[in-house]
């Protein structure tokens, strides 16, 4: 068919409304004005148009607004947004934290796309470190969004931000990002109580120092396994067996099923046998009594 | 396979003795803390008494403290509870059984009965 | 010593039931609670321990929760093989203390 660029008489839109579905594409182009298009983007996401006659309406906005569209159109893209290019979403500055929920909910139970990805990028960047209210946003819709930065990355991230983490939100993340924001999170919750500060802390004890580790054992904490099994190795091995027990309270029970599995392993390996008896668990595999045990670590480390 | 057999149960008049044992097989066990339990004809579980794994720690319930001893030999991967001026309300199915405060392991246990 | 409660002393259900159990102690006993299942002629079997820490074997429709003084294990959906005594014991302190048990019983 040939491409007609006259709008008929009588079919010049007056406003954005669901007459438009009946318009063909070349009708859209012709018989939309782009500027009309713009201050009335809300009433879009309303109206049941094809993803050919979308095609149409991405194309008038971008033909109007070459360099980015302003925040006031970004903001009520709505289905649009699925429209466009990691491109496209460079050129933007979304300042306003409404704007990246309301396209995120365009997109919400879907994997991250690289549009959406790309947005965050851009609202990130321009805020200039991933404040509270942000993480909150993020976490919210992508739970895995936290563990998909790099600790570089990360390393913006204010402790004061911490508060909007939840424990899933860390089920992704590896060691060298759990070491980034364990002190982070150790500095956020420095004012609270013994419990509280240790169901605060405990997602992020991934990251914590053989100190830190030491200082919770004295804290009556009762921690449980699967927190012990993602503790850092080394940070377990100096851990003596009356501070491991001190450590788990309750939960040390549970050592025996996990013996074959790191760190629990290793740890045991560092252990005198007869420590190990007095837990009364049957753990099997520690240094044999009477056996000297030397401090090895410095000569490694020179060799 | 871990497995827990007690013996020496029977029929024993009041004021009078007998020394249960329970033979220990498929696990290392001088490396566990050993327990008796008790459960009484129509009753609940009741817990005797307690051994660490080398025998140098014993922890009684207060009904049978001054009356019974717990022992173990490691050697021979036997426990034993020594039960001396038995009383009608001793009566029960006696159980060893494996662990620290938790029971992991038990024995079928053997029958004690207290009666003149 | 620690007294331990169970509620109720027995129930009847279905195949498919969700079941709770309750257990309170008399103090404080933090996490240092576990839970057995016993069948006529059988051994008790560990279930939970730590309160809420699923002995490793046994069938994730088994949970247990709570801490201080009020203890629940739940079984999600009954199954035949379910039928049975439950205790609860605490670890806290000696005398090692059991609930006085719960018979679940086919309805």
């Known amino acids: 068919e040939v491409e007609k660029t006259a709008c008929p008489s009588g079919k010049k839109a007056r406003e954005i409304d669901e007459s438009l579905i009946f318009y063909k594409k070349w009708e859209l182009e012709a018989c939309v004005d782009a500027a009309l298009l713009a201050t009335q983007m809300d009433r879009v996401n309303a109206i049941p148009f094809t993803y050919e006659q979308l095609d149409v309406l991405k194309h008038k906005l971008d033909e109007l607004y070459p360099q980015g569209y302003p925040e006031s159109v970004i903001q009520h893209l709505g289905y649009l947004f699925l429209k466009m290019s990691p491109e496209d979403i460079r050129k933007w500055n979304v300042t306003s934290l409404e704007t990246l929920k309301a396209l995120l909910e365009v997109n919400k139970g879907h994997e991250m796309s690289p549009q959406v990805a790309t947005l965050i990028d851009r609202f990130v960047k321009g805020r200039g470190q991933l404040d509270k209210d942000t993480l909150d946003t993020l976490t919210a819709f992508y739970p895995g969004y936290l563990c998909s930065l790099s600790p570089e990355e990360l390393s913006s991230v204010p402790p004061s931000s911490i508060w909007a983490v939840r424990p899933q939100d860390l089920d992704t993340c590896d060691p060298r990002q759990l070491d980034v924001l364990y002190p982070k999170a150790r500095l956020a919750f420095q004012n609270m109580n013994g419990s509280e500060y240790f169901v605060k802390i405990q997602s992020f004890l991934g990251g914590a120092p053989t100190e830190d580790l030491k200082a919770l054992s004295q804290q009556n904490v009762s921690m449980d396994l699967a927190t012990f099994m993602k503790l850092r190795t080394d940070a377990v091995l100096p851990l003596t067996v009356a501070e491991v027990q001190k450590l788990l309270g309750p939960h040390v029970e549970g050592l025996k099923a996990e013996e074959r599995h790191r760190p629990v392993r290793d740890w045991i390996l560092r252990q005198r046998q007869d420590d190990l008896d007095t837990l009364g668990l049957g753990l099997q595999g520690g240094i044999p009594n009477g056996y000297l045990v030397l401090d090895l670590s410095m000569q490694e480390a020179l060799s | 396979e871990v497995q827990l057999v007690e013996s020496g149960g029977g029929l024993v008049q009041p004021g009078g003795s007998l020394r249960l044992s329970c033979a220990a097989t498929?696990?290392?066990?001088?490396?566990?803390?050993m327990h008796w339990v008790r459960q009484g004809p129509g009753k609940g579980l009741v817990w005797v008494s307690r051994?660490?794994?080398?025998?140098?720690?014993?922890v009684y319930a207060d009904s049978v403290k001054g009356r019974f001893t717990i022992s173990r030999d490691n050697a021979k991967n036997t426990l034993h509870l020594q039960m001396n001026s038995l009383r009608a309300e001793d009566t029960a199915v006696y159980y060893c059984?494996?662990?620290?405060?938790?029971?992991?392991?038990w024995g079928q246990g053997t029958l004690v009965t207290v009666s003149s | 010593d620690i007294q331990m409660t169970q509620s109720p002393s027995s129930l009847s259900a279905s195949v498919g039931d969700r079941v709770t159990i309750t257990c309170r102690a008399s103090?404080?006993?933090?996490?240092?609670l576990t839970w057995y299942q016993r069948k006529p002629e059988k051994a008790p079997k560990s279930l939970i321990y730590?309160?809420?820490s699923l002995q490793s074997g046994v069938p994730s429709r088994f949970s247990g929760s709570g801490s201080g003084t009020d203890f629940t294990l739940t079984i999600s959906s009954l199954q035949p093989e379910d039928f049975a005594t439950y205790y609860c014991?605490?670890?806290?302190?000696?005398?090692?203390?059991f609930g006085q048990g719960a018979k679940l019983e086919i309805k």
């Open positions: 059984a494996r662990g620290r405060g938790i029971m992991t392991y």
């Open positions: 498929g696990f290392t066990f001088s490396s566990y803390w």
């Open positions: 051994i660490n794994s080398d025998g140098t720690s014993t």
């Open positions: 103090q404080d006993i933090g996490s240092w």
């Open positions: 730590a309160a809420s």
């Open positions: 014991q605490q670890y806290k302190s000696y005398p090692l203390t």
